[in-house]
């Protein structure tokens, strides 16, 4: 049913879904703090622009009686239940900031007449791609896939002179929500990644992964996995690894690699870590004081969601345009806005663009060093360290198939 929106006459409300099931196990209080900090900034920006309006947020909590797994497995119905609650209360804002779980976002998008914008901190899966009124403020699986294909094909870097066309993917089903959907996208037989590779096998058991490390008959030297260094160590331990194995560890939302006192453990020497470029320090902000570095991106996405709404509200109000229109609902894309931590760019489909950073472990310093950056907005790689002190022979990445000559 069409729900009236509290979104006119100088008063603009944001509906924030506070779901028990979330992409990251973040206390809801921290997300509330992030939203409130965002509101303060938006009010200031609107006031500076001479727009005398009220902007508030309504936090919608689910009862937590039925949907209490805490992760995303039971989120599908929770999102719809919350929407029903909003509908019954006739209490819809101008924008919905909410579901971070792919399941819930997909279902809500499918089952509702969305004439309002939806902003998500998460919704990583391919099933949430190309949704006309959905904006995602954390890197979705599609962006990861495009990086991997770009990197696999690259053969003109001083340290990578072979194109790759094969890979193993380790996916054992215990992954975090972001990793689950990243690996799911790589596994999907119809995905861009699968389409571009000649050989790809998913390893589902620890033993399969461990065996590949020294298997002379392996079909690829490259293994993609997702998680942090500790996750890799639990799996790999101190086992010997063939000299031409390359492990790509996807760990996007973890900026510990950039901290000054961090030393790379020995088991990371055959590993390239893919992460996001670190933001400016958020430690001084009130909302982030209690956050671990890995959770900061999630809370920041909520905060940036508020700032994005403020940005769009300002534009529409300055142009004298109505907020409760399909035009407003479809406007949250193909733009750059001033985020909490600097400019944030959204692509044509409302997905955040970012700079991914590929790190290696220097055999000289035992530090993580930047090998290259990749701009998801233009799908381009920028090599940073042309003479990396790799563990691999001749300080070059090996071919993906042992014994195959130059490509």
């Amino acid at each position: 049913s069409q729900v009236s929106q509290n979104c006119h006459n100088g008063s603009y409300e944001i509906s924030v879904l506070m779901m028990g099931n979330s992409a990251f196990a973040e206390p809801l209080k921290n997300l509330e703090d992030a939203v409130n900090e965002g509101l303060e900034i938006v009010r200031g920006r609107l006031q500076n622009a001479g727009l005398n309006v009220t902007v508030n947020a309504t936090f919608m909590y689910s009862d937590g009686l039925i949907h209490n797994s805490g992760d995303c497995r039971s989120s599908t119905c929770e999102g719809l239940d919350l929407l029903r609650k909003i509908s019954n209360a006739q209490r819809m804002g101008c924008v919905l900031i909410g579901p971070s779980c792919t399941y819930s976002t997909f279902q809500m998008y499918l089952d509702t007449e969305l004439s309002y914008p939806m902003i998500s901190a998460g919704s990583f899966g391919l099933s949430c791609d190309y949704k006309e009124t959905l904006t995602r403020l954390m890197s979705p699986a599609r962006k990861l896939m495009y990086f991997l294909v770009n990197f696999w094909k690259t053969n003109d870097l001083p340290f990578k002179t072979y194109s790759w066309s094969t890979s193993y993917v380790y996916k054992n089903g215990t992954e975090t929500e972001d990793c689950f959907w990243y690996l799911n996208a790589l596994e999907a037989s119809v995905s861009y990644f699968s389409h571009e590779l000649g050989f790809k096998v998913v390893l589902r058991q620890d033993k399969e992964f461990q065996d590949i490390l020294m298997d002379h008959n392996r079909k690829s030297n490259v293994i993609i996995m997702c998680g942090g260094p500790e996750f890799l160590y639990k799996l790999k331990g101190d086992r010997a690894v063939a000299e031409d194995i390359v492990i790509i560890l996807v760990d996007l939302f973890n900026d510990q690699y950039f901290e000054d006192n961090v030393t790379a453990p020995d088991y990371m020497k055959n590993v390239l870590v893919l992460t996001l470029s670190p933001g400016n320090s958020l430690l001084n902000s009130s909302f982030s004081r209690n956050l671990s570095p890995t959770k900061r991106d999630f809370a920041l996405a909520y905060l940036n969601g508020i700032l994005l709404f403020g940005h769009m509200l300002k534009i529409f109000l300055e142009n004298g345009e109505n907020i409760t229109t399909p035009k407003f609902a479809h406007a949250f894309r193909n733009l750059t806005f001033e985020g909490y931590d600097g400019p944030v760019t959204l692509d044509d489909w409302g997905d955040v663009d970012s700079t991914m950073v590929l790190l290696y472990t220097s055999v000289d310093t035992k530090k993580y060093k930047v090998l290259l950056t990749y701009d998801t907005h233009v799908n381009k790689t920028y090599p940073v360290d042309m003479s990396p002190t790799f563990t691999w022979k001749n300080s070059k990445l090996p071919n993906d198939i042992t014994g195959r000559g130059p490509q």
Epitope: T336, P343, T355, D375, K380, M386, S387
Partner: antibody
Framework: EVQLVQPGAEVKKPGSSVKVSCKAS????????ISWVRQAPGQGLEWMGR????????NYAQKFQGRVTITADKSTSTAYMELSSLRSEDTAVYFC???????????WGQGTLVTVSS | QSELTQPASVSGSPGQSITISCTGT?????????VSWYQQHPGKVPKLMIH???HRPSGVSNRFSGSRSGNTASLTISGLQAEDEADYFC??????????FGTGTKVTVL
């Protein structure tokens, strides 16, 4: 399309420092590098150094090591080049330029003429 | 060495082809694909004409082409036109993580 905006001119005394800004408008500094290149009157181009703003990584030409500092402010999409202990031979137009690939500068600022004179 | 060597001047008649050379070492021009060419008209900002040895950015005329042999890169301008009269500089990435520019070549259209 991104443009790099620089101030027009600066006049400095020998021994002093100059800090030239370079602001990206119509886009962000993104993940590319920003290089600084100078050109003395009637002379060729001389590379001074570069920064990858998103990471704060810098490289400087040997000739300017210790005298030049390149920084960037991601939040304002602005890069800066500070040159200290100025002498008359530092009189030049100072350009900032975006490296879309190493040593491949596809977008240039208009240049800032720095005149060092007592 | 912190500069790449170019001829001071090259000239040609309209419609002719000319080639400008840029000589370095195996630590710069010969060692990496990161060799570029720039055109600069008097009082103007340099313009990227070729990058990665032989790649033309969009909007650059296909009369401009780049190549490399050993430690020497070359820029060829075919079908020379009056507007091609300008200074041309090569640049290269170097193993010391720096960039070098060439000494510059003045192209005159006779």
């Amino acid at each position: 399309e991104v443009q790099l905006v620089q101030p027009g001119a600066e006049v400095k005394k020998p021994g002093s420092s100059v800090k030239v800004s370079c602001k990206a408008s119509g886009g962000t500094l993104s993940s590319y590098a920003i290089s600084w290149v100078r050109q003395a009157p009637g002379q060729g181009l001389e590379w001074m150094g570069r920064i990858i703003p998103i990471l704060g990584i810098t490289n400087y030409a040997q000739k300017f090591q210790g005298r030049v500092t390149i920084t960037a402010d991601k939040s304002t999409s602005t890069a800066y080049m500070e040159l200290s202990s100025l002498r008359s031979e530092d009189t030049a137009v100072y350009f900032c330029a975006r490296d879309q690939r190493p040593a491949s500068m596809d977008v240039w600022g208009q240049g800032t003429l720095v005149t060092v004179s007592s | 060495q912190s500069e790449l060597t170019q001829p001071a001047s090259v000239s040609g008649s309209p419609g002719q082809s000319i080639t400008i050379s840029c000589t370095g070492t195996s630590s710069d021009v010969g060692g990496y694909i990161y060799v570029s060419w720039y055109q600069q008209h008097p009082g103007k900002v340099p313009k990227l004409m070729i990058h990665d040895v032989s790649h033309r950015p969009s909007g650059v005329s296909n009369r401009f082409s780049g190549s490399r042999s050993g430690n020497t890169a070359s820029l060829t301008i075919s079908g020379l036109q009056a507007e091609d009269e300008a200074d041309y500089f090569c640049s290269s990435y170097t193993s010391s993580n720096n960039y070098y520019f060439g000494t510059g070549t003045k192209v005159t259209v006779l």
